[in-house]
Amino acid sequence: EEELQVIQPDKSVLVAAGETATLRCTATSLIPVGPIQWFRGAGPGRELIYNQKEGHFPRVTTVSDLTKRNNMDFSIRIGNITPADAGTYYCVKFRKGSPDDVEFKSGAGTELSVRAKPSAPVVSGPAARATPQHTVSFTCESHGFSPRDITLKWFKNGNELSDFQTNVDPVGESVSYSIHSTAKVVLTREDVHSQVICEVAHVTLQGDPLRGTANLSETIRVPPTLEVTQQPVRAENQVNVTCQVRKFYPQRLQLTWLENGNVSRTETASTVTENKDGTYNWMSWLLVNVSAHRDDVKLTCQVEHDGQPAVSKSHDLKVSAHPKEQGSNTAAENTGSNERNIY
């Protein structure tokens, strides 16, 4: 009779995480008498997975009844597979011996590969805000996937980005992998409502990629533009001076009026109007009584936006000239009403 062969018919078994793996093994003969054991790995450091003779292996079940005398099917099932179970499994026949059984013949091995889904991509932007025309970096990370093959794309408002670098770690064989990508994005003044999306496609996702997003509203700072204008009011000796603060983001803004360099009043932007692009407008005004002034008055609107150095715009109020002839007749927005009489 031919010598016993241990047949492992599958070079590979591919299983999704959480599922059950079936590792097939048959023997071609009942002789010699002795148990079968399953190991992960080969050599002295191999790990015992199942021993027909003894031991407790809660995740392992046998496909056939190994207690039957004529059984030659030694296939096993391993439940609740995780990426850590990946490796090469050997079905090994032992010959009954005294005091210990002796290894007789091993199968060729079956490589268990585990498909594991990537975690939801996490996108993070720069720690500090940046202004339009600046380039900022976004990172995207996803972990725990297998196999290694993965595709990552970046989008800004649905348009694919090309300036990014991606690494999948580790470089060599591993039970699971991580991906890290850094994309460079040039900010524009219209980006308050913009989104940056990191999209990850993997064989486990069956064509339904995972997405992580970052809102550029968390990243962008649009500095305001200032315009100081003067309009006459009903009383001949009063002038309304307005400071229009336009197109700023975020809302955090403090305005200070200076008269000839001296602080007159400080206020915080509260009732703002929002533009379509997500930026804000705000207006502050002073009611100036010019009759008490012999000299010209230099009015300065100074704005500190989002903790940045202050920007300012000045306006010279000519006391000698007729107030009705001065300034541009800009329509005031009723977003604030602040009076200041100069005596």
């Epitope: 062969q5 047949i7 492992q8 018919p9 599958d10 070079k11 590979s12 591919l14 490796g87 090469t88 199968g107 060729a108 091995g109 079956t110 490589e111 590969s113 196999p147 290694r148 093959d149 064989e173 064989v203």
Partner: antibody, heavy 118, light 108 residues
Amino acid sequence: DVQLVESGGGVVRPGESLRLSCAASGFTFSDHDMSWVRQGPGEGLEWVAGISLRGGVTWYADSVKGRFTISRDNSKNTLYLRLFSLRTEDTAIYYCARESWNTFFDYWGLGTLVTVSS
Amino acid sequence: EIVLTQSPGTLSLSPGETATLSCRASQNVRSNLAWYQQKPGQAPRLLIYDASSRATGIPDRFSGSGSGTDFTLTISSLQSEDFAVYYCQQYGNGPPLTFGGGTKVEIK
């Protein structure tokens, strides 16, 4: 479309070595076991070697055991066969073949010719 | 090693006739048998797997049957493009994977 393109064949003397490559495209390479099958001039098909998804398990025909080495690089979607100590009887067209789930071959390359001659 | 024996070595038939090809295994291979077609200068093409399942894109005039040790490939109503060499292959029994010696179907 699945494509397998072999390269690296040529004329060598007995005892010399060669490395064959098979570039795969149109499918997830790391999801398939792969094999090399050869066909001598005017002869039938002979399976040479096979490899598991990640290269942990390799199978060889007795006729090439110890002389040929199969390997793969999943990052490059490429299968390799190193041929050492070549003999005249190794002269054949070497086909790269994709294995389906039960080790039959559902896609084949066009082959690369290896000629061992003194 | 499982040996596959194909017969006949050559089959001479006319277009429209039915070809019956045989493949016998030296051991029980259950239903783990595939059939391939090879035309001159071309790579083999999978026709049948698991003894009787047609591969994608294979016309239904090709059919496979059998299990254990005796298998048959039948080509009904031969077309001109069917004249080729046909090989059987056993699998699912570990290494080595083996092929039969082939049957040439030629025009009579």
